[in-house]
């Protein structure tokens, strides 16, 4: 599989709520013993490598901002303590996860990575990584949703 | 605040089988692995295995297939390494150290002394 | 199993020198990763995904390299720094750490 992002730039005026996405593409491994862990960190546009640097998200790191699942067990996730750094994780049936930001200020802004970690017993562990912008407006006349593109792109699509 | 403690030193005699504990505290057990390391006299340090307190798989390092035995008790955050049929060559300092998935062993209990001594 | 070797096994430097020190891999690898270790003490991350500092390590401390060859380098030695230092592969089983560079003070 594959971890693509379905808008690479999220734009928001400050106070709203900010939901970023990742997508997992192509078949997944099933069995007991494979597992998938999910994370998200901020990152800086490192000249090697993107997303290389892992810094935290309203002081949570990416060890706080994880959700696994796999083999017959349930996603598992540090609900609580990104609920009270107003965050917050979701993961459905599609592949598809994300990170919600509640009332984002300038501060927020950055490149975000999600991180995806296919574990398999006895078989070294594989990454696929994703990122986007986010780009939080000043002022709280500056709009009144989030705005998500593809910066190559000059249509943009209003994101919940 | 992050904290591995292990068990104490401890004098074994040859043949004989122990276990060490690594008490976890200060962060979400199942979200890591808690991983094994042996540092001989000689200091080398060599990685045992890991165990994954979500769902209880092991990976071992073939050397020491037989001769180490990860458990966890998921209910009391505890990893535990059971040592069997001591030698000397098993006279170590052994540690345990947790690792999210995709980074690195990021805290290290403050290890467990093992001499094995008739 | 990937060997990892470390170079030099020991080395002096003066406060304020700049010091280098080598990790060569018998296989390629993905990435590096350094740790400190002082006497008496356990092992401390230094660097992960072979150029990024770990939380709270001093700005002195960068790491390098792709494939076989990876560095660890201190800009500017301080007498804290001395200490052992390892690298280590998460990129095969079994997961291998070097044999180590003994860095003294001068």
């Known amino acids: 599989f594959k971890v693509t992002t379905p808008y690479s730039l999220y734009v928001c005026p400050e106070g709203q709520n900010a939901t970023l996405t990742c997508r997992i593409l192509g078949p997944v491994s099933k069995g007991h013993d494979v597992t998938i862990y999910k994370t998200w960190y901020l990152s800086s546009r490192g000249e090697v490598q993107m997303c290389s640097e892992r810094r935290p998200i309203r002081n949570l790191t990416f060890q706080d901002l994880h959700l696994h699942h796999g083999g017959h067990q349930a996603a598992n996730t540090s609900h609580d303590l990104a609920q009270r750094h107003g965050l917050e994780l979701a993961s459905d049936h599609h592949g598809n996860f994300s990170i919600t930001l509640r009332n984002v200020t300038p501060r927020d802004s950055g490149l975000y990575c999600c991180l995806v970690i296919e574990l398999k017993n006895h078989h070294p562990e594989q990454r696929f990584y994703g990122s986007m912008e986010l780009q939080v407006q000043a002022g709280k006349g500056s709009g009144s949703t989030c705005m998500a593109s593809n910066e190559q792109d000059s249509d943009s699509i209003t994101a919940a | 605040e992050v904290q591995l403690q292990q068990s104490g030193p401890e004098l074994v005699k040859p043949g004989a089988s122990m276990k060490i504990s690594c008490k976890a505290s200060?962060?979400?057990?199942?979200?890591?692995?808690m991983n094994w390391v042996k540092q001989s006299h000689v200091k080398n340090l060599e990685w045992i295995g890991l165990?994954?307190?979500?769902?209880?798989?092991?990976s071992y390092n073939q050397k020491f297939k037989g001769k180490a035995t990860l458990t966890v008790d998921k209910s009391s955050s505890t990893a535990y390494m059971e040592l069997l049929s001591l030698t000397s060559e098993d006279s170590a300092v052994y540690y345990c150290?947790?690792?999210?998935?995709?980074?690195?062993?990021?805290?290290w209990g403050q290890g467990t002394s093992v001499t094995v001594s008739s | 199993q990937i060997v990892l070797t470390q170079s030099p096994a020991i080395m002096s430097a003066s406060p304020g020198e700049k010091v280098t020190m080598t990790c060569s891999a018998s296989?390629?690898?993905?990435?590096m990763y350094w740790y400190q270790q002082k006497p008496g003490s356990s092992p401390r991350l230094l660097i992960y995904?072979?150029?990024n500092l770990a939380s709270g390590v001093p700005l002195r401390f960068s790491g390098s390299g792709s494939g076989t060859s990876y560095s660890l380098t201190i800009s500017r030695m301080e007498a804290e720094d001395a200490a052992t230092y390892y690298c280590?592969?998460?990129?095969?089983?079994?997961?291998?750490f070097g044999s180590g560079t003994k860095l003294e003070i001068k």
């Open positions: 150290a947790r690792r999210a998935y995709g980074y690195a062993m990021d805290y």
């Open positions: 200060g962060f979400s057990f199942t979200g890591y692995t």
């Open positions: 165990i994954s307190p979500y769902n209880g798989g092991t």
């Open positions: 296989s390629s690898v993905s990435y």
């Open positions: 995904d072979t150029s």
């Open positions: 280590q592969q998460w990129s095969s089983y079994p997961f291998t």
